[in-house]
Every structure is written in structure tokens, then in C-alpha cells.
């Protein structure tokens, strides 16, 4: 691996000195270091109109090192590059530039977006969601009994979160109203509300539903006869059918 030619003749530098500072093996008053001690990197720094040789343990920012058999040398990266593998390939750009395939760009190409954390151009990632789960059982106030009209919910997972320019994620849960054959709650299922009604000695025939957290503002206060209630429910059902024709489901959505 020996060099076929030695380093350029030192005769060009009349005051070459062996008593050098800071890692230099040989130096001159005018040009600083001319060669370095073993394992140190030689770098030429431009100071005004002249170039000064300096010996460092590693190449400074904006330079890359080559370990030749006879000299470890630092070479300048391209002007917009902070760290590079060689002249052709930057690995970290200077502030205000984005890295893309070894090059530093002031903006990312079409179809890519800037990652302001890594300062690289990256592919746009769109949101990906799983299939919907089956609808949950029809419920009201966390119970599956003691009512006729409740809500059912279905959910889905986010499989891939989007990048900054990617499509936003769709809703991850959906809720709709549902109607079931009313069934009485067994003793264990009866909540506080049922006990309160007993305490108030309300009409035995009353089969009023407990209110839905999603569509009522509190407990219904009027007391109706079974016939009145059935008429009212029939009317509500007709209204609901008409509304459902227009809009298949009412969605209460959570977006991630």
C-alpha cells in the first residue's frame, strides 16, 4: 500500500520545523501542520487567503475522513452537508435542508414529506384501520334489560398511524340506537333506579325505560298508563323508521 511518490517536497517550505504543537509531525510557520502524528487526521482549514494545516483526532463537522496508508486526511463534504460518507453521499444535512438519497434539498420531492425530527424526506404514510368489530349487545346505562330502546357500539383498531401529510384516521368507534324486545331485569340486575321507583310507590303498571346517557337529559318525570306508553312508543318507532331511512346510523365517533 506504500505511496509510489512521497509527499510533496518540503523544500517549498524553508522553515519546516520538527518542534510542532498540537499533534503535528512536521509543520511550517506559514502553513501550520504539514503532516500529523499517527492516527490523527490532517485537515486544511482556510483562514482568509491562506490554508493552514491542522491535526485532529477526528474530522470536524462538514468533513469526512479517508485513512490512506501514509496519511489520514479530511475532505470537505458538499456545502449544504454537515456529515457525509464521501463526496457523493451526505448522511446529515445542514440546518434548513432535508436529506434525500444522499443529497441535501431545501424541500422534499413530490410524494415525500419532510420529517422535521430527522430532517429527512420520507414517504407519506396513510392511516390504516382494521375491519369493524361486530356490533355490541343492545344496552342502556350499561344494562341489557329493563328497556326497549338502547344503543349498540362497534369499534376498530388503528393499524398504521399516518405521517404528517398522510390521510387522517377514520372514526374508531360507532354507536347507533337499537330496539329490543323489552325484558324485565332479574333481582340481581335491578339497579338503584329500580329500587327508588319502588320506594316512591309508582304505578305498578308503569314500564318506563331508564333514560339513555346518549339521548336524554335526565329521568322522564311524567307517569303514563300502559296504553299511553304503547301509543307513545308506536309513534316514536314510526319516527325512528322514517329517520333511519334518511340516515342509516347515528355515529358517535372517536378519532385517533
Amino acid at each position: 500500500q506504500n505511496a509510489s511518490r512521497g509527499r510533496r517536497q518540503r523544500r517549498m517550505h524553508p522553515n519546516v520545523s520538527q518542534g510542532c504543537q498540537g499533534g503535528c509531525a512536521t509543520c511550517s510557520d506559514y502553513n501550520g501542520c504539514l503532516s500529523c502524528k499517527p492516527r490523527l487526521f490532517f485537515v486544511l482549514e482556510r483562514i482568509g487567503m491562506k490554508q493552514i494545516g491542522v491535526c485532529l483526532s477526528s474530522c470536524p463537522s462538514g468533513y469526512y475522513g479517508t485513512r490512506y496508508p501514509d496519511i489520514n486526511k479530511c475532505t470537505k463534504c458538499k456545502v449544504d452537508c454537515d456529515t457525509c460518507f464521501n463526496k457523493n453521499f451526505c448522511t446529515k444535512c445542514k440546518s434548513g435542508f432535508y436529506l434525500h438519497l444522499g443529497k441535501c434539498l431545501d424541500s422534499c420531492p413530490e410524494g415525500l414529506e419532510a420529517n422535521n425530527h430527522t430532517m429527512e424526506c420520507v414517504s407519506i404514510v396513510h392511516c390504516e384501520a382494521s375491519e369493524w368489530s361486530p356490533w355490541s349487545p343492545c344496552m342502556k346505562k350499561g344494562k341489557t334489560c329493563g328497556f326497549k330502546r338502547g344503543t349498540e357500539t362497534r369499534v376498530r383498531d388503528i393499524l398504521q398511524h399516518p405521517s404528517a401529510k398522510g390521510n387522517l384516521c377514520p372514526p374508531t368507534s360507532e354507536t347507533r340506537t337499537c330496539i329490543v324486545q323489552r325484558k324485565k331485569c332479574s333481582k340481581g340486575e335491578r339497579g338503584k333506579k329500580g329500587r327508588e321507583r319502588k320506594r316512591k310507590k309508582l304505578n305498578k303498571e308503569e314500564r318506563k325505560e331508564t333514560s339513555s346517557s346518549s339521548d336524554s337529559k335526565g329521568l322522564e318525570s311524567s307517569i303514563e298508563t300502559p296504553d299511553q306508553q304503547e301509543n307513545k312508543e308506536r309513534q316514536q318507532q314510526q319516527k325512528r323508521r322514517a329517520r333511519d331511512k334518511q340516515q342509516k346510523s347515528v355515529s358517535v365517533s372517536t378519532v385517533h
Epitope: Q1, S4, T66, R67, P69, N86, K87, T91
Partner: antibody, heavy 116, light 107 residues
Framework: EVQLVESGGGLVQPGRSLKLSCAAS????????MAWVRQAPKKGLEWVAT????????YFGDSVRGRFTVSRDNTKSTLYLQMDSLRSEDTATYYC?????????WGQGVMVTVSS | DIQMTQSPASLSASLGETVSIECLVS??????FVWYQQKSGKSPQLLIY???RLQDGVPSRFSGSGSGTRFSLRISGMQPEDEAEYFC?????????FGAGTKLELK
Amino acid sequence: EVQLVESGGGLVQPGRSLKLSCAASGFTFSDYDMAWVRQAPKKGLEWVATIIYDGSRAYFGDSVRGRFTVSRDNTKSTLYLQMDSLRSEDTATYYCTAHDRSFDYWGQGVMVTVSS
Amino acid sequence: DIQMTQSPASLSASLGETVSIECLVSEDISNDFVWYQQKSGKSPQLLIYAASRLQDGVPSRFSGSGSGTRFSLRISGMQPEDEAEYFCQQSYKYPPTFGAGTKLELK
């Protein structure tokens, strides 16, 4: 578009000489260290020699040191490899490449056969 | 000189299969490491530099990893055009040295 075109290969007897040339275009030739890498038939890659960008220093692989010399003409963007005292084990495809730690650009290669 | 031990020497993969090639280096070279691809009858082409960075035009199914003394090249989903010989090289110091190569064939 970067192009490296080798020439000068052929059949040569052991002990004789041959000079390969490589014409470069599409990049700033004088900015790059240039190298020769060879590949014997059905074998791997072997670095032969590198000459630095300004032609002031050159380095050689153990197997060719003392027999091969490398030179360049930056005004013509041309790289040369002078091969003397050729041996049968020098039989290979010789590639001209731009050498900057990695071998970034490659020529199509030129075949050198050393045989009696 | 730095020694490069590349394995396997040859490899046969089905279409869509994921393949890995490994290169062990005799001393710590940080990430000063390169992979080349050489298709039959063609010159080698730079594939990956600085151990993991893809050269322009290289499909994203190729990836490089490793640092220090152990490096690998991975092809996630073998394609017919990936049939080639792959070489590793250390770019840490002179003389530049190459692995012996891995011949990748399509099953």
C-alpha cells in the same frame, strides 16, 4: 450521465506488458481518486491500485506492487494502468472506478488474459 | 489488512421470500461499510453505503444493517431482477477489502 470506458485489454504472454486506459465523462474527474479493481473469472473482486485526485500519490495491492504503475491525465480525464511482468494470475476483467471510500462509478470492464 | 468473511457463498430463494446475507469484519469499522450488486456479465453497482443507506434507484425491499464488526443485507421479498452476486466492502481504511461474494439465485 457518468461514463467510464476501459480499453487496451487482450491476450498477452507471461512476462510481457500491457497498458490499459479509461476515459471518463459525466463527472469532475479531477475531484476524484481513481482506482482499478479486477475480477478473475468466476472469482470475487480485488482492489489493484488507487491514484489520488491530483496524481501526486498512488497506492497498490500486495499482488501487483512493483509490477504495475497507475497514472492519470486530468486534462484528458483519462486514467491509465501500466502492467509489466504479467503473470497468469493477473488474468481478469479490469474495472476502472471512481474511488472515494466506496467505489461509486464503474466502467464496463476490460478483459486481460495472460497465457502462453 | 482487514479481513471480510461473507456468508453464505450461495443462496437460492423463491419469489417473494426474504433473504439475508451476512458479512463479518476482522476489526471494528463503525459503519464504514458498503454493499454492491453484480448481475451476470455486468459490472458491480453500489447498492448500500454507510452500512444502511440506499443508493438512489435501489428498491426499498433492500435494507442494510449493522455496525462495528457484523453487517447484513436483507431483501424483503425476492424478485427475479435480484438474481445476482452480492459483495461487501469495508471503506474504513486502506487497502479496501471485499467479501468473497454471495451468489443469489431464484428457485
